[in-house]
């Protein structure tokens, strides 16, 4: 039975040109995390394999940095980066847990004042 839950940073906003850290945390399970995939819609951004380390998709190499931890840092944000991001935890023996983050990239410093942080 899958007992774990994923906490995420929920809905977040950031300023164009800036950077943001996407974070998920898996709790309430003793399952072994074998790999975490970060995806944007249907595009794979990065993989963190527990044994080998990180793989950043070639098309995102210039704007995506691994970490901190199992999180992902997005840099040089553009308005086109607005959208849903998913952290997909592959675990053994539980299976797959998925967390969702919605990022809104704003044109101005409105982002700083309008940032929303929630753990669903």
């Amino acid at each position: 039975m899958m007992t774990g839950t994923i906490e995420t940073t929920g809905n977040i906003s950031a300023e164009k040109g800036g950077s943001i850290i996407l974070q998920c945390h898996l709790s309430s399970t003793t399952a072994q995390v074998t790999q975490v995939n970060w995806e944007q819609q249907d595009q794979l951004l990065a993989i963190c394999n527990a044994d080998l380390g990180w793989h950043i998709s070639p098309s995102f190499k210039d704007r995506v940095a691994p970490g901190p931890g199992l999180g992902l840092t997005l840099q040089s944000l553009t308005v086109n980066d607005t959208g849903e991001y998913f952290c997909i935890y592959h675990t053994y023996p539980d299976g797959t847990y998925t967390g969702r983050i919605f990022l809104e990239v704003l044109e101005s410093s409105v982002a700083e004042h309008g940032a929303r942080f929630q753990i669903p």
Partner: antibody, heavy 117, light 107 residues
Framework: EVQLLESGGGLVQPGGSLRLSCAAS????????VSWVRQAHGKGLEWVVY????????YYADSVKGRFSISRDNSKNTLYLQMNSLRAEDTAVYYC??????????WGQGTLVTVSS | DIQMTQSPSSLSASVGDRVTITCRAS??????LNWYQQKPGKAPKLLIY???SLHTGVPSRFSGSGSGTDFTLTISSLQPEDFATYYC?????????FGQGTKVEIK
């Protein structure tokens, strides 16, 4: 006691194929990722390929991608490496190694693969 | 790929000496750095993982330190069985990559 025992090495002509096996014992094989690492004579270590414990994700070094294929049979506690289109530069001792915490914590004794005409 | 550069490539030392081997990564690898010992004709053995954690059964005279790009393996008092080749390896970015090795010889 953790043990890994490779077999299947030998002499093969360029363009030929070989299948290596690695028999594991002394631990729950299905809980661990495993890699093949090779070492040419008098040279350093080169990671070749990895397979994860449960779901079978695989990662390959660019130098072997499309030519080598890793698989595992958890019911037999055995790891396999199918090597096709072999080249002279694939000549090396091939080790299977268990993954732990980012390192390779236990290694087999190695099996020699020689690609030569 | 991340390049791992070890120095020195070889060194001569005497039993009882303190020996230090360094490993530099071409970019940050946080603390995802492992050290191995290999003797001629034998498989490598893991000594240190995650930069400073001692693997099971490894004598306490071996220690590791560092983070980011610069790492050190120290043998506090060299023993006869320590003459071997030592390799560092990063496990931060796929593919895992090894240093070229440091051969520790008897002076």
């Amino acid at each position: 006691e953790v043990q890994l025992l490779e077999s299947g090495g030998g002499l093969v002509q360029p363009g030929g194929s070989l299948r290596l096996s690695c028999a594991a014992s002394g631990f729950t094989f299905s809980n661990y990722g495993v890699s093949w690492v090779r070492q040419a004579h008098g040279k350093g270590l080169e990671w070749v390929v990895y397979i994860n414990p449960s779901r079978g994700y695989t990662y390959y070094a660019d130098s072997v991608k499309g030519r080598f294929s890793i698989s595992r049979d958890n019911s037999k506690n055995t790891l396999y490496l199918q090597m096709n289109s072999l080249r002279a530069e694939d000549t090396a001792v091939y080790y299977c190694a268990r993954s732990y915490g980012g390192g390779f914590d236990y290694w087999g004794q190695g099996t020699l693969v020689t690609v030569s005409s | 790929d991340i390049q791992m550069t070890q120095s020195p490539s070889s060194l001569s030392a005497s039993v009882g000496d303190r020996v230090t081997i360094t490993c530099r990564a071409s970019q940050t690898i946080e603390r995802r750095l492992n050290w191995y010992q290999q003797k001629p004709g034998k498989a490598p053995k893991l000594l240190i993982y995650d930069a400073s954690s001692l693997h099971t059964g490894v004598p306490s005279r071996f220690s590791g330190s560092g983070s980011g790009t610069d790492f050190t393996l120290t043998i506090s008092s060299l023993q006869p069985e320590d003459f071997a080749t030592y390799y560092c390896q990063q496990s931060y970015i796929i593919p895992p990559t090894f240093g070229q090795g440091t051969k520790v010889e008897i002076k």
